[in-house]
Structures are given as structure tokens and as C-alpha cells.
């Protein structure tokens, strides 16, 4: 167990733990103090004791020992009084730190005393060698517990230069592969540097004497070190491995290293000392095997095989760890070690080897683990696991601390938890104690909640409730108990309504540039803070201050000016502090394609055949397949900025060979088209000019017509520039009279016309027009018939007669004219006619003439829309291209017809049962009026009960109808008549019912002069006539409110003038009917120009 930080108020003891100790190997030099360090923590305070070579050692009782008086320290220092006092203290030391919970133990500290280094006295004989031979100058330094450094120097303290020939070995000897006379020196001195004592000692100088020789004999290599053919050595894992081969021979041998058993680990191998030394860093198991050195010169080679075995000091696989345990738990301390050879593991408890402990102990050792079952406080101990092999020793202290702690709930009491329906709630109850307390959750009734499968407990005391329901709201109790006590807390759970998106955004496809609106409706628990936000492809969307791209309001997201980059997934996120729901929609932005990015012309050699190949890169389709590509061209010379389509190709095609015209400056562009229309065009291509060629087309619409009687103008539609096939084009015009078979006359012109002069009137000609350019002529042209100029026709159409069809239409007929007298192409006939006046009376008005053009192949015409009962004048002329000929004239009259409708029918109410009808005669009599026909019927009887009678006086303008029902509305119809019958009707609806009720003055107003006032009103259509009084009453004190006598007025008269009024006076006008007040208004008469005094009592400014 681990005591949580929140578990307060329990002062737990701590077993001893070694915090600092001296290194495993301590070398002491003559002048040094001996300091043995051992520090440990623990509660209660730790006591220290030492052993030396397994025997109890009491530092305090030793002379010259200073013990540190510190609560956590058992360290001591020995100060010597002579140079070899340390010899007395050599040995293996161990420190034990104890308190009432157990004993921790330090590792073994080997204390070694190193004396002052001295070279044994020796007499060094001179070394004599012949030039070319090998020699070894020995060093043999005194032994040292610490590594030392060797240098070879001469008496001038100059280093002996080393190279492939002269080398110092790892053992300090100086090896010469072959000697030169220059090696002859008497002062080869070996220096040994002892870093520990900071001293350098030197060997007696060696005198090397080299005898010169005339003939140095070549020798094959021989190894000076190692001397045998093979050797075995042990390398320690993780440590460096140094292999050395030093050879002699002449010429000087070179050294190579090989590894027959596998590849040399290049990243960890270095070669030193002119290849004589191989150093392998951080040896691993894989470095086991054979390493070979090969010494070579021109005469041969020598080799040595090193067989390397990789071994390892003990190392941890699993180091035992200190732990706290509650009563009843099982304690297991794992001590897994590895090494080569396999280390031997021993256990101690509180520093005592388990073998020395009483046999009734409850521990057991199983596969490198120390196990104690059902631990109790009395089982608290510090254990030591020690592993050793020949390369080293490994020690670990680990305690088993069995504590008894009362149960305590570390979660706050009375916490409120909120979660939404359908989700999972987690009620916390973190409890601690030793033994580990049991945790139970109870409902308000004290019943365990675990009967419902939705409730599930966690090992850490948390209670989970899944698929929350509204009725899970309430109080829950957590009870934690161990053998010392029990404690309870309460948790409040409130289950809220889950947030739901009731209508999420819908996936949509929209056009570029348009706007899209996504809507989102959600329901929230009313007690929670709701939020609706929007995300686009996982990014939060916000209205940007400097842009109106997004508009977000009331669950709506509007994206303006859609672009293809706006395409993606948009989601509405509805959230509260308790839950989040998301609804996603996909937006596809569609539109016309993107531009064609690249356009290339190829096969330009085909230009000579008026072809070229155009290739392009496909355009972006913007989510609508490209249906076609439009290839266009522009000629910058002839029609700049004007693009012509050369054709369209299917949307899956990206190249085409185009058929071109000769001599056009082509610049191409390609536009992709999909269902939304064309995209932006591609960049323009380079301009290419097709070679010139003779024209392939001739002009069309060739015509020959005179614009005078003695000429013929030949015209044609000029060739479009793209058909010229050259920089310029001209026209070869040929003509001859038709049927002569004579020679053609010809002229070449640049204009699109030619005037042939001195021709006879209206003669047919054969005409040909051919395109010509610098490369030749166009194809053989077709012959067209043209005519020389026309003259005015001399033919007069002969009238056959006029047939009266009805009162407003006649049929005019004439005989065809003699074509010889037309003097040109008969284009048709002009028929002109006009009304001379009515048969009733002739008018003096301006005469309006009507014209009808009749085609040449027609000799009759119907003139319609004529006025009945009228006299007409008629002219018929033949016409050709020059104009009209002489006219044939005729006069005719139209018979009587029915008249037009009467004008302005008014209904005037006379009483509840009578109406006066008032009208005006029709504008168009179309004959002699004979009278009127009046018909009427009640409206609600659907046309039944129609009454109709003739009014035989054409001068009649009014008619009084009596015996009408005051409760009905009527439809009145009035028609004028001639002998041909009744004409169009005028219709009005009305009756006495609606009109004889409360009188209505309608739009009534009053105006005033100096001494009079005019009251005007508009009588309502059909309103019954009635009489009423008008009373003028003067206002103001000096007038005394004087009234004029009331006047009797008739409604139909529309206005009334009251005279004898006072100037500059306000009057009230009262209208009465049958003594009932009906209306009131005010008016003021004009002043006379005199200055008037204000009435008494008024202040003036």
C-alpha cells in the first residue's frame, strides 16, 4: 500500500534506509585520512554499527577516530599519525543502520592502503643489438591498486617518438620492430605516474647500443606480444575490451584485425597505436568470439588469435522494492539477477543471513523471491538480497512495513454530482486504511445499490451508474470499514435531461458564390446552460469581425459567398456543462469548372496542311463532371479580343487535332464546361500563322440590280477575313447579257460591289463573282441572273369590281397588269383608300389614308374595318423596284350598320320606387338612329323577369322608371337602334334600396369670398334626391353668434351659394334634414383690406 497525501493525522514510522555510503573500493594513500561514510534515514532515529572483516568494529573505541554526531549519520574519519597507519585499518567494512522496525545494511567497503610507490633497486645493463634487429626495453613498474600511466622519455624529458616501428605496449614495455642506428641512446627512461598519490617515479635509464651493419637482412614478422599463437581472455559486459598485437620484422610490419566469427562492430571499434591496439567500447554478449591480428610485411605474416569470452558482473533484472503492507496482505520481494557466471543469491533479514535465523520463521524463498503471507505488524523488517559472482557483488535493501491505519474516506462529504439521462455517472468514494477498508454503497433506505445491474463498483471505491434514469436522482451513502473503524459519506446525484439535437443540419450541394444556411434545433435541460456552436472540418467556427463570411445566430449557420475551399463537413455542437451532442452535414460546393491550367501546341508541322494539335491539362471539375471542352481562337491581327469557337470535344478528352484555315493568326484557348456552365479559359497559347493558300470559297448572295434606269449594280456578301486565306482578297466579277453566249466582261475589285453603266432598261444579265488572292483564284463560281435598272411602271390595273361583304368590309378585284408595261420586276400592288365622309353629313376633317400592299401574284384584296354608312375613295397602282405606276380610281359606299353603345348612362333616384335614367347618344351612329331599347331585370333572380321596351324617339335623353322594388338591385341595359337593329349596350347596376337610406353628402367642401360662401358636394351615383336645410352661423363675440335664416336646398343641385355674409368672419355651416342635424363644417370669409381692431379684452403685442 501507499499512504495517500490526503491521509493526514497519522504519524507513521519509517524503517531505516541507507541514503549514502562509501564506494565499494576505497584506496587510501599514506598522507590521506580514512573516511568511511554511512548515512541513513528512518523514524524513530537510526542507530549505526560497523563490522570489519565480519567482526564487530566500534569506531569510537579506536584511536584517532572521529565519529560524526549527526542523527542520520554513522560515518567516521580516521586521522593517521604516521605514514603507514592505514595498513592497520585495511579490511572489508560494513555498516548496519537500525531502528525498532528493522536493520538496513550497506554494501561491503574494501579499504586498501597504498604505500608510497618505489621502483625496486636494480642494475640495468646496457642493451646491445645489431642494426635491423628487434628489441624490447622493459619497464616493469611497481604494482598499484589504482591504474597508472607510463611514459618513455629521455633525460631531457622529451618523449620518445612512437610510430609503426617503435611502440609502447599496454604493459609499459617499449618495443622496437627493428632498430636503426638513430635509436642509439643511453637514456631511455620509463616514467610511472601514480594519480592517486600524485607522484611520478622513474626507472633507471636504459642504454640502447645499436651496432651498425652493412647488410640489413629482411625478416618476416614475428609477434613480440602476445608471444604465443593464441590466448583466451575474459571481457566484462559494459566495459571496454583492449586487444594488442606488437610485431617485429624488417621491413616494419603492418597490423590488420579480423573477426572470423562475425562482422566487426564498426560503431564501437577504434584502432590506436598505429593499428596495434583494438579497443571495443561497451562490450556486449554479441562480442563473444575470436578476434585475429595479422602482422604483414613483404616477406610474410604472423598472426595471433584472441578467444574472447564475455562475462558479466551481477546486474538487476528485478530489484526488490520497499513497500507498505496492511495486515493480512502477502508481501513478495523479487530479487532477479543476471550475470556470467550466474550469480549466487543470498537473503538476509535485518542484516542477518536467513540461514542463521530460527527455522520457524514464516517467510519462504521461491524462485528468487522472498514471500511472507498474511503479514502482521510484527512482520515489519528490512531485507537484504545479495548476489555475487567472481566479477562483483550486488546488494539491495528493501523493507516490508506492515502498518495498521484506521479507515478514512478521502472524498469530500455531501458532494453533488450531475449527469444527464442515458449517460454514466461516477460517484467517488476514495477510502484508505490498513487493512484496506471494504467499501459499500447504499441508497437512502440503507439498501445496497448493487441489486440493480446498472450500478457497478470500481476497486478504487467509485460507484458507476450506467443508463441513467430520471428516478436515479437522490442521495447515496458510501460506507468504508476495516478492523479498526468505519466511516460514511453522502453523495447527491441529480439526473438532468440529456441534450438532444431535434433537427440537425442537412447535407447539401450548393453553387459557388451562393450562400448556404444550416439550421440546428436542440432541446436542453432547463436548469443547464445551453450552447450551440458550429464546427467546420473539426475547427470551431466564429463570426469574424472583419469579414461577413459566417453568420451565426439562433441555431443558424449561414456561410456567404461559397467557395470550393468551404466544402467539407459542418457540424452543430449542442452542449451543456454536462454533455455534448453533435450532428454532422456535408457541404459540397459545385460550380462551373476551374480554368484549364496548361495548354500546349504540338505537331506544328501540320500547319502546312492547315492543322495543329492542341493538348491541355484537365480542369478541376468542381464536383460536376466536365461535359466538354470548348476550343476557341482569336486572330489578334484581324479581330483582336474576339474569340471564335473551333469546336467542342468530350470532357474526357485532353487533346485534339484542329482543322484550320490558311493564313489566320491563331491564338487558342480552351474552356471546360460542366452542367453549371463554362469555367475560366486556359492561358492563351502561342500564336501560330497558317501558310497562305488560294481561296476555298466564293462570295455568296450575289445580286444584280440597277439603282438607275441605265445601270446594274452587282453586289455580294464579302468573304469573312478567315476565308481570305491570305493578307488580302479581291473579287473577279464577270457579266454578260443573258442568252447571248458572247464573251464575258470582267473586272477585279476590292470593294464588295461593282457598277455596270450604260445598260438598257431592265435587261437580264448572267453574273459570276470569284474570290482571288496572291495565291490564286477560288473555285469556279456559280452563275446568277441579275437585271439592269428599272423604270416606273406604265401599266394601270383594270378594276373588275367591288363586292360589299358587310357594313364594314368590301372585296376589291382587278385584272393582272401587262408585265411588259411594268418596266421591271412587278413587286405587287399598292391599294390606297380613305373615307370621304358619312352619308349623313360630310365632315371637313383631315383625311386619313389607309394602305394595303398586295403581292404581285394576287389581284384582289378584302378591305375590312370600314365605317358603316360611309363614302370611300379607292386607288390601285402596280409597283416595281423603282416605284409605283399610274392609279386606277373608284368610289364606293358602305351600307348602314348597328350603332355604337350610348354614352354615359346615369341612374338618378326619384323615390323609393322610381329612378330617372339619363344618357347621351352613341358616338358612332353607323346609320340613321331610330330610337333606343331599354331592358332591365332584378339581379338576384338570375336574369329572370327581364323587362324590355322600345323607346322610339331617337332624340330621347332620359326615361323615368316607376314601380321598382325598394328592396332589389337591378341590371339596366340600354342600346341605340338603326334600321339594322340594336347596337352595343351600355350596362349599369343599381336600385332605390341602397340609395334611399341615410343621405350621404360625399366629398363636401366650402369656399368663401368677401361676402359669400359656396358649399359644394358630389351627388352619389343613383342616390335618391332629397331636400335639406343649410344654416350659416357667424362666430365671435361682436357678431353675437348671429345666424342667417336657413335655406332649403335640393341634393341634386351639387352646390349652394350663400350671399350677404360679413367679411373676415368665421362661420359655422350646419346641414339639417327633416330637423335632424347631419353635418357641420367651418369657413372664413375674406377681409376687405381695412385694419380691424381686435375684440375688447385681447392683449396686443
Amino acid at each position: 500500500i501507499q499512504i495517500p497525501e490526503e491521509y493526514e493525522g497519522h504519524h507513521v514510522m519509517e524503517p531505516p534506509v541507507i541514503t549514502e555510503q562509501s564506494p565499494r573500493r576505497l584506496v587510501v594513500f599514506p598522507t590521506d585520512d580514512i573516511s568511511l561514510k554511512c548515512e541513513a534515514s528512518g523514524k524513530p532515529e537510526v542507530q549505526f554499527r560497523w563490522t570489519r572483516d565480519g567482526v564487530h568494529f566500534k569506531p569510537k573505541e579506536e584511536l584517532g577516530v572521529t565519529v560524526y554526531q549527526s542523527p542520520h549519520s554513522g560515518s567516521f574519519t580516521i586521522t593517521g599519525n604516521n605514514s603507514n597507519f592505514a595498513q592497520r585499518f585495511q579490511g572489508i567494512y560494513r555498516c548496519f543502520a537500525s531502528n525498532k522496525l528493522g536493520t538496513a545494511m550497506s554494501h561491503e567497503i574494501r579499504l586498501m592502503a597504498e604505500g608510497a610507490p618505489k621502483w625496486p633497486k636494480e642494475t640495468v645493463k646496457p642493451v646491445e643489438v645489431e642494426e635491423g634487429e628487434s628489441v624490447v626495453l622493459p619497464c616493469n613498474p611497481p604494482p598499484s591498486a589504482e591504474p597508472l600511466r607510463i611514459y618513455w622519455m629521455n633525460s631531457k624529458i622529451l618523449h620518445i617518438k612512437q610510430d609503426e616501428r617503435v611502440t609502447m605496449g599496454q604493459n609499459g614495455n617499449l618495443y622496437f620492430a627493428n632498430v636503426l642506428t638513430s635509436d642509439n641512446h643511453s637514456d631511455y627512461i620509463c616514467h610511472a605516474h601514480f594519480p592517486g598519490t600524485r607522484t611520478i617515479i622513474q626507472k633507471e635509464p636504459i642504454d640502447l647500443r645499436v651496432k651498425a651493419t652493412n647488410s640489413m637482412i629482411d625478416r618476416k614478422p614475428r609477434l613480440l606480444f602476445p608471444t604465443n599463437s593464441s590466448s583466451h581472455l575474459v571481457a566484462l559486459q559494459g566495459q571496454p575490451l583492449v586487444l594488442e598485437c606488437i610485431a617485429e620484422g624488417f621491413p616494419t610490419p603492418t597490423i590488420k584485425w579480423l573477426r572470423p566469427s562475425g562482422p566487426m562492430p564498426a560503431d564501437r571499434v577504434t584502432y590506436q597505436n598505429h593499428n596495434k591496439t583494438l579497443q571495443l567500447l561497451k562490450v556486449g554478449e554479441e562480442d563473444d568470439g575470436e578476434y585475429r591480428c595479422l602482422a604483414e610485411n613483404s616477406l610474410g605474416s604472423a598472426r595471433h588469435a584472441y578467444y574472447v569470452t564475455v562475462e558479466a558482473a551481477p546486474y538487476w533484472l528485478h530489484k526488490p522494492q520497499s513497500h507498505l503492507y496492511g495486515p493480512g496482505e502477502t508481501a513478495r520481494l523479487d530479487c532477479q539477477v543476471q550475470g556470467r557466471p550466474q550469480p549466487e543469491v543470498t537473503w538476509r533479514i535485518n542484516g542477518i543471513p536467513v540461514e542463521e535465523l530460527a527455522k520457524d520463521q514464516k517467510y519462504r524463498i521461491q524462485r528468487g523471491a522472498l514471500i511472507l503471507s498474511n503479514v502482521q505488524p510484527s512482520d515489519t523488517m528490512v531485507t537484504q538480497c545479495e548476489a555475487r559472482n567472481r566479477h562483483g557483488l550486488l546488494l539491495a535493501n528493501a523493507y516490508i512495513y506492515v502498518v495498521q491505519l484506521p479507515a478514512k474516506i478521502l472524498t469530500a462529504d455531501n458532494q453533488t454530482y450531475m449527469a444527464v439521462q442515458g449517460s454514466t455517472a461516477y460517484l467517488l468514494c476514495k477510502a484508505f486504511g490498513a487493512p484496506v477498508p471494504s467499501v459499500q454503497w447504499l441508497d437512502e433506505d440503507g439498501t445496497t445499490v448493487l441489486q440493480d445491474e446498472r450500478f457497478f463498483p470500481y476497486a478504487n471505491g467509485t460507484l458507476g451508474i450506467r443508463d441513467l434514469q430520471a428516478n436515479d436522482t437522490g442521495r447515496y451513502f458510501c460506507l468504508a470499514a476495516n478492523d479498526q473503524n468505519n466511516v460514511t459519506i453522502m453523495a447527491n446525484l441529480k439526473v438532468k435531461d440529456a441534450t438532444q439535437i431535434t433537427q440537425g443540419p442537412r447535407s447539401t450541394i450548393e453553387k459557388k458564390g451562393s450562400r448556404v444556411t444550416f439550421t440546428c434545433q436542440a432541446s436542453f435541460d432547463p436548469s443547464l446552460q445551453p450552447s450551440i456552436t458550429w464546427r467546420g472540418d473539426g475547427r470551431d467556427l466564429q463570426e469574424l469581425g472583419d469579414s461577413d463570411k459566417y453568420f451565426i445566430e439562433d441555431g443558424r449557420l449561414v456561410i456567404h459567398s461559397l467557395d470550393y475551399s468551404d466544402q467539407g463537413n459542418y457540424s452543430c455542437v449542442a452542449s451543456t456543462e454536462l454533455d455534448v451532442v453533435e450532428s454532422r452535414a456535408q457541404l459540397l460546393v459545385v460550380g462551373s469548372p476551374g480554368p484549364v491550367p496548361r495548354l500546349v501546341l504540338s505537331d506544328l508541322h501540320l500547319l502546312t496542311q492547315s492543322q495543329v494539335r492542341v493538348s491541355w491539362s484537365p480542369a478541376e471539375d468542381h464536383n460536376a463532371p466536365i461535359e466538354k471542352y470548348d476550343i476557341e481562337f482569336e486572330d489578334k491581327e484581324m479581330a483582336p479580343e474576339k474569340w471564335y469557337s473551333l469546336g467542342k470535344v468530350p470532357g474526357n478528352q485532353t487533346s485534339t487535332t484542329l482543322k484550320l484555315s490558311p493564313y489566320v493568326h491563331y491564338t487558342f484557348r480552351v474552356t471546360a464546361i460542366n452542367k453549371y456552365g463554362p469555367g475560366e479559359p486556359s492561358p492563351v497559347s502561342e500564336t501560330v500563322v497558317t501558310p497562305e493558300a488560294a481561296p476555298e470559297k466564293n462570295p455568296v448572295d450575289v445580286k444584280g440590280e440597277g439603282n438607275e434606269t441605265t445601270n446594274m449594280v452587282i453586289t455580294w456578301k464579302p468573304l469573312r477575313w478567315m476565308d481570305w486565306n491570305a493578307p488580302q482578297v479581291q473579287y473577279r466579277v464577270q457579266w454578260r447579257p443573258q442568252g447571248t453566249r458572247g464573251p464575258w466582261q470582267e473586272q477585279i475589285v476590292s470593294d464588295p460591289f461593282l457598277v455596270v453603266s450604260n445598260t438598257s432598261t431592265f435587261v437580264p444579265y448572267e453574273i459570276k463573282v470569284q474570290a482571288v488572292n496572291s495565291q490564286g483564284k477560288g473555285p469556279e463560281p456559280q452563275v446568277t441572273i441579275g437585271y439592269s435598272g428599272e423604270d416606273y411602271p406604265q401599266a394601270i390595273p383594270e378594276l373588275e369590281g367591288i363586292e360589299i361583304l358587310n357594313s364594314s368590309a368590301v372585296l376589291v378585284k382587278w385584272r393582272p397588269v401587262d408585265l411588259a408595261q411594268v418596266k421591271g420586276h412587278l413587286r405587287g400592288y399598292n391599294v390606297t383608300y380613305w373615307r370621304e365622309g358619312s352619308q349623313r353629313k360630310h365632315s371637313k376633317r383631315h383625311i386619313h389614308k389607309d394602305h394595303v400592299v398586295v403581292p404581285a401574284n394576287t389581284t384582289s384584296v378584302i378591305l375590312s374595318g370600314l365605317r358603316p354608312y360611309s363614302s370611300y375613295h379607292l386607288e390601285v397602282q402596280a409597283f416595281n423596284g423603282r416605284g409605283s405606276g399610274p392609279a386606277s380610281e373608284f368610289t364606293f359606299s358602305t351600307p348602314e350598320g348597328v350603332p355604337g353603345h350610348p354614352e354615359a348612362l346615369h341612374l338618378e333616384c326619384q323615390s323609393n320606387t322610381s329612378l330617372l335614367l339619363r344618357w347621351q347618344p352613341p358616338l358612332s351612329h353607323n346609320g340613321v338612329l331610330t330610337g333606343y331599347v331599354l331592358s332591365y331585370h332584378p339581379l338576384d333572380e338570375g336574369g329572370k323577369g327581364q323587362l324590355s321596351f322600345n323607346l322610339r324617339d331617337p332624340e330621347l335623353r332620359t326615361h323615368n322608371l316607376t314601380d321598382l322594388s325598394p328592396h332589389l338591385r337591378y341590371r339596366f341595359q340600354l342600346q341605340a337602334t338603326t334600321k339594322e337593329g340594336p347596337g352595343e349596350a351600355i350596362v349599369r347596376e343599381g336600385g332605390t334600396m341602397a340609395l334611399s337610406g341615410i343621405s350621404d353628402f360625399g366629398n363636401i367642401s366650402a369656399t368663401a369670398g368677401e361676402n359669400y360662401s359656396v358649399v359644394s358636394w358630389v351627388p352619389k351615383e343613383g342616390q335618391c334626391n332629397f331636400r335639406f336645410h343649410i344654416l350659416f352661423k357667424a362666430l365671435g363675440e361682436e357678431k353675437g353668434g348671429a345666424s342667417l335664416s336657413p335655406q332649403y336646398v335640393s341634393y341634386n343641385q351639387s352646390s349652394y351659394t350663400q350671399w350677404d355674409l360679413q367679411p373676415d368672419t368665421d362661420y359655422e355651416i350646419h346641414l339639417f334634414k327633416e330637423r335632424m342635424f347631419r353635418h357641420q363644417m367651418a369657413v372664413k370669409t375674406n377681409g376687405t383690406g381695412r385694419v380691424r381692431l381686435p375684440p375688447a379684452g385681447f392683449a396686443t403685442e
Epitope: L604, H605, L607, K636, V684, E686, V688, V689
Partner: antibody, heavy 119, light 107 residues
């Protein structure tokens, strides 16, 4: 009369870039494409690429793709050719030439700019 | 890319001699071939296009012929001012490619 005037000779280190200018006069600059051609010492002519000065659209020979950039400035009637990651084999005379109106031929040439690439 | 191979790489002829230079294309280029003249220390100058059309201002002693893959430039009567290197160029397809050049000298 039509003239194309190029910038002066350049000596560059391998790996660096060079930018050669070509100022046009005597005609409407935007009406004719500008092409670039180079000639290594004692060697033939090698086409590099072109630019349309009216739209600034350019295209290059595959060999120079990614290393060459041809640009134009209508306001000064000047075309530019920039070659990057120079190597010793880029030592050459670089010519700008006006493309004939109507065919990919070279009717007017600049005087040439010698570019030497040497460490 | 279309390769243009010129031969000979150099020639020496006397004033008044008829000189012929050939150019071979690695594929059919129709008549989309031009010839240029580059005098020592000068820029190239267009002589002929469409294999046989003389550029304006070029003396009539220069002529061109050929179609498909084989083309010829002929100087009917060599003049001292004709000393130059002559290049053929194909413009049927991009990249535009030139021949290696033919150096013409006076004996």
C-alpha cells in the same frame, strides 16, 4: 527599331542563383513572347523556355524544370530569367530572343549574357 | 524530345563554291524546320523557315529544301561574308531543339 538589351556578365559560385534581364524596345512588348536560349562554350544552342508578357504565363524545357523561372515586368518592358542551384555545366552565354509572330522562331536576339559558374 | 543531327560539323570551301549542309530529325517534323546563321562573336540570325521560305532580307543564294526527317541548306555561291556556324531548328514540337551546328570556312 526592335532591340533586346541584356544585363552584364556574371560570375557565380556553384549552388547559387543568377538572374539575367532583357529589356525590349521598338515594339509592343506584350504582343510577342520572349524565349530564352543558351549556348555553352564551343557548343550549340539549347532552348530553355518562354514567357507570354501579356498574361505572364511561362513554360520551360523539362531539363530546366524546377531550376529556371522566367518572369516579365510590363511596366518596364523587361523579361527576366533566373537559374538556381548553379553547377559548372551551366557556364554559358544566355540569350533572350523575341518569338516571331506566328511561329516559334527567333527573329530578334539580345546580345547575350555570359554566366560563369566557378568555385 | 526530337533530336536534330547536323552534318558535317565543319567544312571548308572556296569562294563561289556550292555548299550543302544537311540536318536529320529523329522523327517526322513535316517542313517545320528553320535555319540560322551565327557569325563569330555575333548572335544567331534567322535565314529560312518552313524548310524553304526565305526570311526577309536574306540573299537569294541561300535556299532550303526537304520534308519529313531530311533537310538541306544550300549556299549556291559561297561568299566571304558567309563564314559562320549554321544551325537547324525544328519547331514541330516542344521543346524546340537545334542541331549541333556546321562551321563553314573559306579555303
Amino acid at each position: 527599331q526592335v532591340q533586346l538589351v541584356q544585363s552584364g556578365a556574371e560570375v557565380k559560385k556553384p549552388g547559387s542563383s543568377v538572374k539575367v534581364s532583357c529589356k525590349a524596345s521598338g515594339y509592343t512588348f506584350t504582343n510577342y513572347w520572349i524565349q530564352w536560349v543558351r549556348q555553352a562554350p564551343g557548343q550549340g544552342l539549347e532552348w530553355m523556355g518562354y514567357i507570354n508578357p501579356s498574361t505572364y504565363y511561362s513554360d520551360y524545357a523539362q531539363k530546366f524544370q524546377g531550376r529556371v523561372t522566367i518572369t516579365a515586368d510590363e511596366s518596364t518592358s523587361t523579361a527576366y530569367m533566373e537559374l538556381s542551384s548553379l553547377r559548372s555545366e551551366d557556364t554559358a552565354v544566355y540569350y533572350c530572343a523575341r518569338r516571331q509572330f506566328g511561329l516559334p522562331l527567333f527573329d530578334y536576339w539580345g546580345q547575350g549574357t555570359t554566366v560563369t559558374v566557378s568555385s | 524530345d526530337i533530336q536534330m543531327t547536323q552534318s558535317p560539323s565543319s567544312l571548308s570551301a572556296s569562294v563561289g563554291d556550292r555548299v550543302t549542309i544537311t540536318c536529320r530529325a529523329s522523327q517526322d517534323v513535316g517542313t517545320a524546320v528553320a535555319w540560322y546563321q551565327q557569325k563569330p562573336g555575333k548572335v544567331p540570325k534567322l535565314l529560312i523557315y518552313w524548310a524553304s521560305t526565305l526570311h526577309s532580307g536574306v540573299p537569294s543564294r541561300f535556299s532550303g529544301s526537304g520534308s519529313g526527317t531530311d533537310f538541306t541548306l544550300t549556299i549556291s555561291s559561297l561568299q566571304p561574308e558567309d563564314v559562320a556556324t549554321y544551325y537547324c531548328q525544328q519547331y514541330s514540337n516542344y521543346p524546340l531543339t537545334f542541331g549541333g551546328g556546321t562551321k563553314v570556312e573559306i579555303k
